[in-house]
Interface confidence: low
């Protein structure tokens, strides 16, 4: 780690739209990118009548909003699509929804990694 931060080398991959996009549905994604840029993991999901539907998970490019976040937490209040990002290998394996100024239960990611998917 550099300056105490966790280097992201790989993230959990998931694509609900895998058939149309012609990718695997799940796997482990190696994160590539410029050496001078930070890499992150992300998760995005929807809450359909209390049921969690994961949309995508994977690597995320250098984004200041993700710096030094070890946990993947969405803080926006009731977004249409939930999004979180984090730093650290497979840190998007679990994700939570904690809107600021409000207390709710965390949402855990039920997806289990499958064999690696490569682009």
């Amino acid at each position: 780690a550099i300056l105490g931060r966790s280097e992201t080398q790989e993230c959990l991959f998931f694509n609900a739209n895998w058939e149309k996009d012609r990718t695997n549905q799940t796997g482990v994604e190696p994160c590539y990118g410029d050496k001078d840029k930070r890499r992150h993991c992300f998760a995005t999901w929807k809450n359909i009548s209390g049921s969690i539907e994961i949309v995508k998970q994977g690597c995320w490019l250098d984004d200041i909003n993700c710096y030094d976040r070890t946990d993947c937490v969405e803080k926006k209040d009731s977004p249409e699509v939930y999004f979180c990002c984090c730093e650290g290998n497979m840190c998007n394996e679990k994700f939570s929804y904690f809107p600021e100024m409000e207390v709710t239960q965390p949402t855990s990611n039920p997806v289990t990694p499958k064999p690696p998917y490569y682009n």
């Epitope: 739209n17 149309k20 996009d21 012609r22 990718t23 994604e29 190696p30 994160c31 590539y32 990118g33 995005t44 995508k56 994977g58 690597c59 995320w60 490019l61 984004d63 249409e80 699509v81 999004f83 490569y118 682009n119």
Partner: antibody, heavy 120, light 107 residues
């Protein structure tokens, strides 16, 4: 320095075929997803096709599906686009472009383009 | 397919002006938006990726914002070399789709 150099364009009659090539250098080609994007004269950009690092996954725009085939030869650092059953509306400058990272987030390098003209 | 609606299609501005170009997606695409600059007879050049991140070598006067369906490219102080056509592009899913372009012309 990343370089992408397209070739193979030219004048072809409707119904004819062309094979475009894109020679890549300056980056690890066999790690990179690649794309073809075209631009008709005076018009905007239209994505045509993509291929993953080893050719295992390909994608096509509906307008070219069944007529165009994308492929790559990693030993030659070259991307190809085989275009069959060409139509007048396929007339465009064809660019090859490289994905910025594994996740297909953006196209960070583009070639200079090669012009394909379909006309009788 | 996801439609990307860009506006305006053209604008006239002077050197030093603040220029804003908008792009609207037909569905939520998170931050999967990129912006390109294209000059006549040249290939497009990546300016902004992932909605807000400047590509390597791009001046700080270029910035991007937005998430979900509405996105903006802003040039804080237009320079002579910025007169060009700008395109937004979604990379949320295949097929990748582009906006119709915004031509930034000299007033």
């Amino acid at each position: 320095e990343v370089q992408l150099l397209e070739s193979g364009g030219g004048l072809v009659q409707p119904g004819g075929s062309l094979r475009l090539s894109c020679a890549a250098s300056g980056f690890t080609f066999d790690d990179s997803s690649m794309h073809w994007v075209r631009q008709a004269p005076g018009k905007g950009l239209e994505w045509v096709s993509n291929i993953n690092y080893n050719g295992g996954y390909t994608g096509y725009a509906d307008s070219v599906k069944g007529r165009f085939t994308i492929s790559r030869d990693n030993s030659k650092n070259t991307l190809y686009l085989q275009m069959n059953s060409l139509r007048a509306e396929d007339t465009a400058v064809y660019y090859c472009a490289k994905s910025a990272n594994w996740h297909d987030t953006a196209l960070d390098y583009w070639g200079q383009g090669t012009l394909v003209t379909v006309s009788s | 397919d996801i439609q990307m609606t860009q506006s305006p299609s053209s604008l006239s501005a002077s050197v030093g002006d603040r220029v804003t170009i908008t792009c609207r997606a037909s569905q939520s695409i998170l931050s999967y938006v990129n912006w390109y600059q294209q000059k006549p007879g040249k290939a497009p050049k990546l300016v902004i990726y992932a909605a807000t991140s400047r590509a390597s070598g791009v001046p700080s006067r270029f910035s991007g914002s937005g998430s979900g369906t509405d996105f903006t490219l802003t040039i804080s102080s237009l320079q002579p070399e910025d007169f060009a056509t700008y395109y937004c592009q979604q990379s949320y899913e295949l097929p990748l789709t582009f906006g119709g372009g915004t031509k930034v012309e000299i007033k």
